[in-house]
C-alpha cells in the first residue's frame, strides 16, 4: 500500500508539451493584418468566410461578398477592384516556388451579383492584379501581359515573347524571385493606372538544374529550371512602360539603364512609382558593393521615358555589400522628388536618410548604435518607421513616429510602452494617409494585433487577441526562455536560451545548439513560438540555444560585413564560442552538445560539426549548402563576389562541406535533404555524402522524394519524428 | 446632377416599423447605387442599407434581416422597409446617390444627398 502524494493542485494538472502538440500545430497563433480600402475601411474574411467591410469611424460592418459565392468557385483568395464593382475569386491554387503560384480567376460583379460571362480569363494564369483605380486588370499568361479595360472585355495581349523557361514578362525568373525582388510578380502599375510598367527577364543563355520528379509514373519527370549558379550566366533584364488608356498607340517603351551600371553585368532590384508620370528604378552591378537610383520622367513630346544622370543617385559599400540582405527602397515625399531611404551612416548603422538633390547632401534622420529596419509610411507631418533602439535589444522591433512637420522633429515611441512584458516585436499596416493603422505584436508574449488611430496613436479595439490559445496553454508547462549577450574579443554575441521548465542551474544538461547564420539574418528575436525545440526543453529536457554571431544584422555593419567575402568561417567560429561560454556557466553537460540547422543553418551545423574541436557529439544538417558554387549566383556573389582565379575562387573551395570530410569521423551526424529542392539542390547533400563514403566515414542520411526545400506536408512529421529519435539517441534519453 | 427628397419619417414605439421613402429627379436614376445612411446626435453618418444600379443589396450587420432596401426604377424612388425597431435606430435617415458601386460606407464617397428625415424609437 502506497501513500497518496499531495500535489499542488495546478502542478498536477501541468504537462509538458508533446511532439505530436507541435506536429498538430495545437498551439500556433493567428494574427489579423486589415485588408485596407480607404482610410478608414478594410476587409476580412470572417471565420466563417463571409468577406466583410468593417468602417472604422461608424464601427459597422457589411457582408460584401458571402461564402457560398465564395464556395460555388472553391475560391481561396479574392480582390475587390477600386471601384468597388467586381472581385477577382481565386482558386485551383498551386505552387510553384517560394512566392510563385498558378491559379483560376473568376470575376464577380458586385451590382449585379453575377460572374462575369464572356471574354472570361484563361487559366492558369501566372499573376493577375487590378489597376490602383477604377477596375482595369492586368494579367500574365503563359509568360505574356494581358491588359482589361474592363473585366468583361477582350483583352489586349502587350507582350508577344514570353516562353517557358526563356522570356518572363511580369513575372520573374528563379532567382529573381528567390533573391531579388522577392515577389511573384513583375508588373506595377502607376498610382492612378495610367501607365503599366514590367519587367523582361531573358533566361536564354542561363544553364538549366535538372533533377527528377519521382511521382507514381512508370518514369520520373524531369523538372528543368534556369538556375544561375554562382559565377554562372545570369539573366538579363529589361524594364518596359506602356501607356494603359491607348495600349497600341506607341506600344511599350524601354527605360534606359543607367551607363555606369550597363557597363558591365547588372540587375534591376525594384520599381517605385512616384507619380503617373515619375517612376523610379534601382539598379545593382553583378559585384554587389553598388547600387544606383534612377528618377525618371515621362515625355509627353515623344511619348518616351527620360533618366537624366542629374537624378541619379549612387548608393556604395567599401566595407561589405549595397543594403542588408537587399538595397533598401525609397519612400518618396509628397514633392514627388525627395525621398527617405534607410542606408548605413558614417558609423557603420543603417539608418533613415532624406535625400533631396544627392545622396552626399542626405540629411541623416536617425541616429545611434542601433538599426532603423523599415519605413512603414510618410504623411504630411509623421513618418512611421520601426528600429531595435528601446533598451537595446538588438532582437525587438518598436515602432516611431518622427514629426516631420516641425522643426526640429520630435520622435514618439508608438510600442514602447504598450504592452511591455508581452510585446516587444511589432509590424504594422496602415489605412491611406495613415489615417488608422493596426499593430501586430509577435511577442515575446501571446500575440494580439490592436487596432490604432493614426493621429492620437490612442487603441481602438483589439482585433485578435490569441484567447483560444492562452487557455489552451493554461495547463502547459512552457520552457522558460531568456535573451542575453556575451562579450567576446570586442564582439557581442546575443544568445536565446531556452531552458526545461523545471530548471535547475546545479544541475546538468544536454545542450542543442539552433543555427540559421546566414548574412543579414537575425535568430535572436523577441517572438513568441511553440515549436520543436519549446518541445525538446518542457518534455525532454534539454537546454536550447540560438546565437547571432558574426555576419548577422541589426547590430551595425561591422558585425554584418565581418564575414563578407569569408562565408563559412566567423560564423562557425562564432557558434563554438558561444558553446564554450555556456559549458563555462555550469550547467551543461559537456559530453551532451549537439547543433543542427536547415539550409544556410545546416552548411553552419556542417562545418561546426567537421571544426575538429570535439565539442560536438553529434549534429544534424537539413538541406545544407554544401559549396557555395553550388547555390544561386545573386545571393552567393553577394556575399562572396566570384568563383574566378582572379576574384574568390580560393575561399569557394576553402568554404566546403565535402573539404572536411575527414572530420566527421568522430562525430554522429545526420544528413537530410528533400530530392525535389529546387532552391538549395539535393547535389549539396549528394556531395557531402558522396565525400563521406569516400573517406569511409560513417554517418547517418534521410531523403525525402520529390520533397523541396520546406520538407512540408506529411514529410514535417516524419522529419521531426526523425530527428528526435536521433537527438534522443545521442544524448541517452529513453523513449 | 441627382435631386433626393425623403419622406416617411416619424415617431414610433420599439419593435414597430417605419417605411421611408425617397424620391429622386433624373433621368438616369436606374444607373445610380442608391444608399439609406442615418445619423444619431454625435455620431457619424453611417450607412444602413444600400442598393446597386443591378439591383443588389447590402446592410449594416446591425441592421441586417430588420431593414428591406428596394427600388422603384419606374417612379425613381428607393424605400427603405424598417421593421423591430430598436431605440438604437433612432437618428436622422438620410437618402444617399453616386455613380457606381454601391458597396462605399463612408459618407465622403456618396455626392449627392436628401436633406434628411427624422427617425424616432421610443421604448
Known amino acids: 500500500l502506497r501513500p497518496s502524494r499531495v500535489h499542488n493542485s495546478e502542478e498536477n494538472t501541468m504537462r509538458a508539451l508533446t511532439l505530436k502538440d507541435i506536429l498538430n500545430g495545437t498551439f500556433s497563433y493567428k494574427t489579423f493584418f486589415p485588408n485596407w480600402i480607404s482610410g478608414q475601411e478594410y476587409l476580412h474574411q470572417s471565420a466563417d468566410n463571409n468577406i466583410v467591410l468593417y468602417n472604422i469611424e461608424t464601427g459597422q460592418s457589411y457582408t460584401i461578398l458571402s461564402n457560398r459565392t465564395m464556395k460555388s468557385v472553391n475560391a481561396s483568395n479574392y480582390g475587390l477592384s477600386p471601384d468597388r464593382q467586381f472581385v477577382y475569386l481565386e482558386s485551383d491554387y498551386s505552387k510553384l516556388w517560394r512566392y510563385s503560384y498558378t491559379a483560376t480567376y473568376y470575376i464577380y460583379d458586385l451590382s449585379n451579383g453575377e460572374f462575369v460571362r464572356g471574354n472570361e480569363l484563361p487559366r492558369p494564369i501566372q499573376y493577375l492584379c487590378w489597376s490602383p483605380v477604377g477596375s482595369k486588370l492586368a494579367y500574365v499568361y503563359q509568360n505574356n501581359i494581358y491588359l482589361k479595360q474592363r473585366p468583361g472585355d477582350p483583352p489586349f495581349q502587350i507582350t508577344f515573347n514570353g516562353r517557358e523557361n526563356k522570356i518572363f514578362n511580369g513575372i520573374p525568373d528563379w532567382v529573381y524571385e528567390e533573391e531579388m525582388l522577392p515577389t511573384k510578380y513583375a508588373l506595377w502599375w502607376s498610382p492612378n493606372g495610367k501607365f503599366l510598367a514590367y519587367a523582361e527577364f531573358n533566361d536564354k543563355d542561363i544553364p538549366v538544374i535538372a533533377y527528377s520528379y519521382y511521382g507514381d509514373e512508370q518514369y520520373p519527370r524531369t523538372i528543368n529550371i534556369p538556375y544561375p549558379k554562382a559565377g554562372a550566366k545570369n539573366p538579363v533584364v529589361r524594364i518596359f512602360i506602356i501607356d494603359t488608356t491607348y495600349p497600341a498607340y506607341v506600344g511599350p517603351q524601354e527605360v534606359p539603364v543607367p551607363a555606369m551600371i550597363a557597363s558591365s553585368d547588372y540587375y534591376f532590384s525594384w520599381l517605385t512609382w512616384v507619380t503617373d508620370e515619375r517612376v523610379c528604378l534601382q539598379w545593382l552591378k553583378r559585384v554587389q558593393n553598388v547600387s544606383v537610383l534612377s528618377i525618371c520622367d515621362f515625355r509627353e513630346d515623344w511619348q518616351t521615358w527620360d533618366c537624366p544622370k542629374t537624378q541619379e543617385h549612387i548608393e556604395e559599400s567599401r566595407t561589405g555589400w549595397a543594403g542588408g540582405f537587399f538595397v533598401s527602397r525609397p519612400v518618396f515625399s509628397y514633392d514627388a522628388i525627395s525621398y527617405y531611404k534607410i542606408f548605413s551612416d558614417k558609423d557603420g548603422y543603417k539608418h533613415i536618410h532624406y535625400i533631396k538633390d544627392t545622396v552626399e547632401n542626405a540629411i541623416q534622420i536617425t541616429s545611434g548604435k542601433w538599426e532603423a529596419i523599415n519605413i512603414f509610411r510618410v504623411t504630411q507631418d509623421s513618418l512611421f518607421y520601426s528600429s531595435n533602439e528601446f533598451e537595446e535589444y538588438p532582437g525587438r522591433r518598436n515602432i516611431y513616429r518622427i514629426s516631420i512637420g516641425s522643426y526640429p522633429p520630435s520622435k514618439k515611441c508608438v510600442t514602447c510602452h504598450l504592452r511591455k512584458e508581452r510585446c516587444q516585436y511589432y509590424t504594422a499596416s496602415f489605412s491611406d494617409y495613415a489615417k488608422y493603422y493596426a499593430l501586430v505584436c509577435y511577442g515575446p508574449g501571446i500575440p494580439i494585433s490592436t487596432l490604432h488611430d493614426g493621429r492620437t496613436d490612442q487603441e481602438i479595439k483589439i482585433l485578435e487577441e490569441n484567447k483560444e490559445l492562452e487557455n489552451a496553454l493554461k495547463n502547459i508547462q512552457l520552457p522558460k526562455e531568456e535573451i542575453k549577450k556575451l562579450e567576446v574579443d570586442e564582439i557581442t554575441l546575443w544568445y536565446k536560451m531556452i531552458l526545461p521548465p523545471q530548471f535547475d542551474r546545479s544541475k546538468k544538461y544536454p545542450l542543442l545548439i539552433q543555427v540559421y547564420g546566414g548574412p543579414c539574418s537575425q535568430s535572436v528575436r523577441s517572438v513568441f513560438a511553440v515549436n520543436w525545440i519549446s518541445y525538446l526543453a518542457s518534455k525532454e529536457g534539454m537546454v536550447i540555444a540560438l546565437v547571432d554571431g558574426r555576419g548577422t544584422a541589426f547590430q551595425g555593419d561591422k558585425l554584418l560585413y565581418a564575414v563578407y567575402r569569408k562565408l563559412g568561417v566567423y560564423e562557425v567560429e562564432d557558434q563554438i564560442t558561444a558553446v564554450r561560454k555556456f559549458i563555462e556557466m555550469g550547467f551543461i553537460d559537456e559530453k551532451r552538445i549537439a547543433i543542427w540547422g536547415w539550409s544556410y543553418g545546416g552548411y553552419v551545423s556542417s562545418l561546426a560539426l567537421a571544426s575538429g574541436t570535439g565539442l560536438f557529439k553529434c549534429g544534424i544538417a537539413v538541406a545544407p549548402v554544401s559549396s557555395w558554387e553550388y547555390y544561386a549566383s545573386v545571393y552567393t556573389e553577394r556575399f562572396m563576389g566570384l568563383p574566378t582565379k582572379d576574384d574568390n575562387l580560393e575561399h569557394y573551395k576553402n568554404s566546403t562541406v565535402m573539404a572536411r570530410a575527414e572530420y566527421f569521423r568522430n562525430v554522429d551526424y545526420l544528413l537530410i535533404h528533400g530530392t525535389a529542392d529546387d532552391n538549395v539542390h539535393f547535389q549539396n547533400s549528394a556531395q557531402i555524402a558522396k565525400a563521406l563514403v569516400n573517406a569511409q566515414v560513417d554517418f547517418q542520411a534521410m531523403w525525402y522524394s520529390d520533397q523541396n526545400h520546406g520538407l512540408s506536408g506529411l514529410s514535417t512529421n516524419h522529419l521531426y519524428t526523425h530527428m528526435t529519435h536521433f537527438l534522443k539517441q545521442c544524448f541517452s534519453l529513453s523513449d | 446632377q441627382v435631386q433626393l427628397q425623403e419622406s416617411g419619417g416619424g415617431l414610433v414605439q420599439a419593435e414597430g416599423s417605419l417605411r421611408l421613402s425617397c424620391a429622386a429627379s433624373?433621368?438616369?436614376?436606374?444607373?445610380?447605387?442608391m444608399g439609406w445612411f442615418r445619423q444619431a446626435p454625435g455620431k457619424e453618418r453611417e450607412l444602413v442599407a444600400g442598393?446597386?444600379?443591378?439591383?443588389?443589396?447590402n446592410y449594416a450587420h446591425s441592421v441586417k434581416g430588420r431593414f428591406t432596401i428596394s427600388r422603384d426604377i419606374d417612379k425613381n424612388t428607393v424605400f427603405l422597409q424598417m421593421n423591430s425597431l430598436k431605440p438604437e435606430d433612432t437618428a436622422v435617415y438620410y437618402c444617399?446617390?453616386?455613380?457606381?458601386?454601391?458597396?462605399?460606407?463612408?459618407?465622403?464617397?456618396?455626392?449627392?444627398w436628401g436633406q434628411g428625415t427624422q427617425v424616432t424609437v421610443s421604448s
Open positions: 444617399a446617390a453616386r455613380s457606381g458601386g454601391a458597396y462605399y460606407t463612408s459618407r465622403v464617397d456618396w455626392p449627392y
Open positions: 442598393i446597386s444600379s443591378g439591383g443588389i443589396t
Open positions: 433624373g433621368r438616369t436614376f436606374g444607373s445610380y447605387a
